[in-house]
């Protein structure tokens, strides 16, 4: 069964900066990658970044890089200055539309104990939703 | 509502150059992709030219070099410059936008009218 | 560039007839592909994409099937409304690419 992982960790030297990094243990290729805040994408979260393996990246304030690490993984660095910036407690989802297995979501936020510049290991995440 | 409206059409000689803007109204301008797409008269539909939200542009080889597209967030407009005209892009230009990327354009204008003729 | 064949070019069909219209990519683009419908003079209007999920508002006799490099525009009951030209885009890569359409006709 496809799985998705998410890890979340705040740079130790901007304490307000956040990396989400999200990966996709599946078969299948992937076709579309969202992440958002605040919830699951179209269940009150907030779209960050849209990433599509040919016509490239897209990404929105407070986001300022995504990229993919790896066919099946990416990574988003947000910034963490002004009202929109991301607080220890926010939820990061993301979803992966695999071709042709469909789609799954994850959801992760920084670890309660975490130190700056520390994180979790990147352990899959619960699966929320498998559409 | 969502709303886009073109203007600057007209007849221009070949050779000539043309502005082509859309006013946009109704949802977040800076967040989405635009489009430009034509249609000659009796033809089918032409991507022309798209702008994302950072500003990249991207053209079909028919119009590269020739048209160039951009956009004023502050002002929720967007623009085709099309220059060294020909015939074969007499057409009606419909500004799109492509409000849930990457899934193609969702909200479309009237269009306006080129006519390149000598 | 990805090539879009659209077939039929044209049909004609009588009201509560079914209706399907094919799209052919020139290459693999999973699911990344919309339908659209335009009236003459008016400016076309979104009834699917990716390549199944029907548009806001759109009436449910409209269905889009298929993956990689075919597709299908299905309208299970034509109705009055529905007689007008049909485009199918691609919107997996640039440069983005339309079919060359199908004008569905009163028999």
């Known amino acids: 069964t496809p799985e998705v992982w998410v890890q979340v960790r705040m740079e130790a030297t901007e304490l307000s900066s956040f990396t989400i990094r999200c990966g996709f243990l599946g078969s299948g290729s992937i076709s579309l990658v969202t992440v958002s805040w605040g919830g699951p994408n179209g269940a009150g979260g907030t779209t960050l970044a849209v990433l599509h393996p040919e016509r490239g990246i897209r990404q929105w304030a407070p986001a300022r890089q995504a990229r993919w690490e790896t066919q099946s993984s990416i990574s988003l660095i947000l910034e963490g200055s002004g009202a929109s910036s991301p607080c220890a407690n926010t939820t990061f989802c993301c979803k992966f539309a695999s071709f042709p297995e469909g789609s799954w979501e994850a959801c992760g936020s920084l670890p309660p104990s975490s130190d700056p510049g520390l994180s979790a290991p990147p352990t899959p995440a619960p699966i929320l939703r498998a559409d | 509502e969502v709303q886009l409206v073109e203007s600057g059409g007209g007849l221009v000689q070949p050779g000539g150059s043309l502005r082509l803007s859309c006013a946009a109204s109704?949802?977040?301008?800076?967040?989405?992709?635009m489009h430009w797409v034509r249609q000659a008269t009796g033809k089918g539909l032409e991507w022309v030219a798209a702008?994302?939200?950072?500003?990249?542009?991207y053209y079909p080889g028919s119009v590269k070099g020739r048209f160039t597209i951009s956009r004023e967030n502050a002002k929720n407009s967007l623009y085709l410059q099309m220059n060294s005209l020909r015939a074969g892009d007499t057409a009606v230009y419909y500004c799109a936008r492509e409000g849930q990327w990457p899934y193609g354009m969702d909200v479309w204008g009237q269009g306006t009218t080129v006519t390149v003729s000598s | 560039d990805i090539q879009m064949t659209q077939s039929p070019s044209s049909l004609s069909a009588s009201v509560g007839d079914r209706v399907t219209i094919t799209c052919r990519a020139s290459?693999?683009?999973?699911?990344?592909l919309g339908w659209y419908q335009q009236k003459p003079g008016k400016a076309p209007k979104r009834l699917i994409y990716a390549a199944s999920t029907l548009q806001s508002g759109v009436s449910s006799r409209f269905s889009g099937s298929g993956s990689g490099t075919e597709f299908t525009l299905t309208i299970s009951s034509l109705q009055p409304e529905d007689f007008a030209t049909y485009y199918c885009l691609q919107h997996n890569s640039y440069p983005l690419t339309f079919g060359g359409g199908t004008k569905v006709e009163i028999k």
């Open positions: 290459q693999g683009i999973r699911n990344d």
């Open positions: 109704g949802f977040t301008f800076s967040r989405d992709d």
């Open positions: 702008i994302d939200n950072a500003g990249d542009t």
